[in-house]
């Protein structure tokens, strides 16, 4: 997260760290007791590595009573996701067991009504991604509030030049932005999950390259079919 601040500890009980061989790889969001939603591209280079999900965390390194690392029983990338596109960049991870819920671990309601969030709406994005252009990784969860950007502006040639489909949404990126390591994390508007940070190699913090988020409402049928 660029231009953000440290989050209040455990105030986002849905927040997950998707880990590869014990190190933070991507963000994720608990959407059901046994399911975490993230971004498909996160596992592209995972190969034979061990993928796990950390729940109930604020600090990645410090012991916390609510922290627990879960093995992944099943990883389900969206069937249409492809390495070279930002489209359909969703991944569902089934935990080895149902998460132990409590004040610091709780699923987040996700948007099912397929309607765009109004431009200008302030939404919260959180993650353990880099916090500066030098690539510094934070130990504790960071967050930032970002205004939603209308799709027409996001589709301008100097922005994302027509790449933003109806299944994607954008948020402003003027110094405050999601960045590398935040992919798969939640964009929350009005207490509801609206978007998932896409995991392309996008320049961060440049106002002409807005953050791109996969609209979960557009994938409600797929999410429901996997969780069923």
């Amino acid at each position: 997260i660029l231009g953000g601040r440290e989050a209040e500890a455990h105030a986002r009980p849905y927040m997950a760290s998707v880990q590869l061989n014990g190190a933070h790889l991507c963000g994720g969001v608990l959407v059901a007791e046994q399911w975490v939603l993230s971004a498909a591209h996160c596992l592209e280079d995972a190969a034979d590595g061990k993928v796990q999900v950390l729940l109930g965390a604020h600090s990645l390194s410090q012991p916390e009573p609510s922290k627990r690392l879960y093995d992944v029983l099943r990883a389900v990338p969206h069937p249409d996701s492809q390495p070279d596109t930002i489209d359909h960049d969703l991944l569902l991870l089934q935990l080895s067991e149902k998460a132990t819920l409590g004040p610091a671990v709780r699923p987040l309601p996700w948007q099912r009504v397929d309607r765009d969030v109004a431009p200008g709406t302030l939404c919260d994005v959180a993650g353990w991604g880099i916090v500066n252009h030098a690539g510094r990784r934070p130990d504790s969860l960071q967050h930032v509030l970002l205004p939603v950007l209308d799709r027409a502006t996001c589709n301008r040639r100097t922005h994302h030049d027509g790449a933003i489909t109806e299944r994607l949404m954008c948020a402003e990126s003027n110094r405050r932005d999601s960045c590398k390591g935040d992919s798969g994390g939640p964009l929350v508007c009005g207490g509801v999950l609206e978007g998932v940070v896409t995991s392309g190699s996008r320049v961060c913090g440049n106002r002409k390259k807005p953050g791109i988020y996969t609209r979960v409402a557009s994938y409600a049928a797929w999410i429901d079919s996997v969780l069923a």
Epitope: A152, N155, R156
Partner: antibody, heavy 116, light 112 residues
């Protein structure tokens, strides 16, 4: 299939007004800026300006700012170009073109002739 | 405003020829996001322009590989490696980095 269809061109006297329409189909109208470009007979392409179909924000080439105005009817997925105080040198084919990707989609153009 | 000057204004060539059109801008067209929004369009009489190249060197989908773009800063080139009968048209460079966006004056490619 993305389609842009211009209409409203024709013969108009100097000092007169004309409103051109650009009807869009095959995509969500509010997802892309609309631009207007013109081409005088035997001449090159000249950008008039653009409009954001969500906010209505406009940007005009300074040469056209005082006499030309963009508007929208999102319910009809249509953009409009209102041209006032027309002069002989405004005689041209007028195009609308969607921005994103680049100017990949253009209308067929509509000819405006300003003559007495 | 940024002026784009194309050369030559017109040229005569034969099928199979290699054709090069240059476009020079009056100032740099590197956008503040680091990208260069230099595009090339083809236009045939009575028709709307067609996008060939975007961001200096990227061919738009469906554009034949004989079309290529290159350049940086203020000097840009469109090359047609082996001219085909359907390539006889007018070609325009365009910059979208700075408002007002502008077109070059065009280069007409005619049959020799």
């Amino acid at each position: 299939e993305v389609q842009l269809v211009e209409s409203g061109g024709g013969l108009v006297q100097p000092g007169g007004s004309l409103r051109l329409s650009c009807a869009a189909s095959g995509y969500t109208f509010t997802d892309y800026y609309m631009n207007w470009v013109r081409q005088a007979p035997g001449k090159g392409l000249e950008w008039i300006g653009d409009i954001n179909p969500v906010t209505g924000d406009t940007d005009y080439n300074a040469d056209f700012k005082r006499r030309f105005t963009f508007s929208l009817d999102t319910s009809k997925s249509t953009a409009y170009l209102q041209m006032n105080s027309l002069r002989a040198e405004d005689t041209a084919v007028y195009y609308c073109t969607r921005e994103g990707p680049s100017f990949a989609y253009w209308g067929q153009g509509t000819l405006v002739t300003v003559s007495s | 405003d940024i002026q784009l000057t194309q050369s030559p204004s017109s040229l005569s060539a034969s099928v199979g020829d290699r054709v090069t059109i240059t476009c020079r801008s009056s100032q740099t067209i590197v956008h503040d996001n680091g990208d260069t929004y230099l595009e090339w369009y083809q236009q045939k009489p009575g028709k709307a322009p067609i996008l060939l190249i975007y961001k200096v060197s990227n061919r738009f989908s469906g554009v034949p590989s004989r079309f290529s773009g290159s350049g940086s800063g203020t000097d840009f080139t469109l090359t047609i490696s082996s001219l085909q009968p359907e390539d006889f048209a007018t070609y325009y460079c365009f910059q979208g980095s700075h408002v007002p966006v502008t077109f070059g004056q065009g280069t007409k490619v005619e049959i020799k």
